[in-house]
């Protein structure tokens, strides 16, 4: 007779969730000379320690930490990228600008990109069905406490300009409620950081507002002027010609705005 | 590959003020470019550092408030105006670009041939 299954809302663990992780990690670190002293059979087995046999609402920060410290890496404070709602740019951007650092540029993230996964109480089995929806089911599911943790180590790991991209064209340009709202700009380290530099990115051709001054990018600046650290913005009005331009800076067009 | 070639050191009195500049070649965009300095028996130490595209600036805390670091892209010149010099502002001061922080430890990748500036009391 098969065992009833608990129902989640959202889709279940990413198919070959085991295969991908260790092949990730295994490219990872083959393609990064600094992680190659990691153990990429001690970080899947510290990964599936952290959900396996737990209920999948019920997870903490605590249930990571020894991936956190198998994947303890370091990258230069002043390089680093966060963005919201907009990944893609920002991953395009830190291929070509190879040395600056989004959370996906690193070990652990970039193991869980675009992955889902969840276990069963008290059983060894992953879960492929469903996986709690975090509004939903639960906030306290493994996806979520996962990025949580990574994005706060990676925050409080930020100092001098912070870097982050946002996403012009959302009704919310800064939304209080995505990760880096809610998690990473309260663990900037006023004592580290001095500046958060963000940079917005206009969606429309002909888009020539000037969406520094939009009510949530002054949302922002409040928030963070409050951690007693600086606050400055820019206008991306045409990404693809940013991207041209970190590509090929000595172009003439690239003194312009851009 | 960047060049870096700074200018507008010298002698200057003690409450005097300075403006070094460095001209910079080759790739520019998006480089966090700093000034140095280095004193006489000392390690060269940071000073101050600005972001090349968003021109958002940071300094070391013995310069706040009287240093400050500027750059115009359009002559692709980094400045360093220096105000209320004190007699120990006296070092080697260096453009860098490239800048790197791992935790204390600041490097860059591209380095200047430095320009002397001397505050006499």
């Known amino acids: 007779v098969p065992r009833w299954r608990q129902q989640w809302s959202g889709p279940g663990t990413t198919k070959r969730f085991p295969e991908t992780v260790l092949a990730r990690c295994v490219k990872y670190t083959e393609i990064h000379p600094e992680m190659r002293h990691v153990d990429c059979q001690s970080v899947w087995d510290a990964f599936k320690g952290a959900f396996i046999s737990k209920h999948p609402c019920n997870i903490t920060e605590e249930d990571y930490q020894p991936l956190m410290k198998l994947g303890t890496q370091t990258v230069p404070c002043n390089k680093i990228l966060l963005w919201s709602r907009i990944k893609d740019l920002a991953h395009q951007f830190t291929q070509v600008q190879r040395d600056m650092f989004t959370l996906e540029d690193t070990l652990l993230g970039y193991l869980a990109d675009d992955l889902t996964w969840c276990g069963e109480f008290n059983t060894s089995k992953i879960n492929y069905q469903s996986c709690p929806d975090w509004r939903k089911d639960c906030s306290n599911n493994p996806v979520s406490v996962f990025w949580k943790t990574v994005s706060r180590r990676f925050a409080e790991a930020a100092c001098d300009v912070v870097h982050v991209m946002l996403n012009g064209s959302r009704s919310k340009i800064f939304d209080k409620n995505s990760t880096f709202g809610s998690v990473e700009v309260h663990n900037l380290q006023p004592e580290k950081v001095q500046t958060l530099e963000a940079w917005v990115i206009h969606g429309g051709r002909e888009d020539s507002r000037d969406l520094c001054q939009d009510p949530t990018i002054k949302e922002l600046e409040s928030i963070i002027s409050k951690r007693n650290i600086q606050f400055s913005c820019k206008n991306i009005y045409r990404p693809d010609k940013f991207l041209q331009c970190v590509k090929n800076p000595e172009d003439s067009s690239c003194t312009s705005e851009i | 590959q960047v060049q870096l070639q700074e200018s507008g050191g010298g002698l200057v009195q003690a409450g005097g003020s300075v403006r070094l500049s460095c001209a910079i070649s080759g790739r520019t965009f998006i480089n966090d470019m700093g000034w140095f300095r280095q004193a006489p028996g000392k390690e060269r130490e940071f000073q101050a550092g600005?972001?090349?595209?968003?021109?958002?600036?940071y300094y070391a805390d013995s310069v706040k408030g009287r240093f400050t670091i500027s750059r115009d892209n359009t002559k692709n010149t980094l400045y360093l105006q220096m105000n209320s010099l004190k007699p120990e502002d006296t070092a080697i001061y260096y453009c860098?670009?490239?800048?790197?922080?791992?935790?204390?430890?600041?490097?860059?990748?591209?380095w200047g041939q430095g320009t002397q500036v001397t505050v006499s009391s």
């Open positions: 600005i972001t090349w595209f968003g021109g958002s600036t």
């Open positions: 860098a670009a490239g800048l790197k922080r791992i935790g204390d430890q600041r490097e860059a990748d591209y």
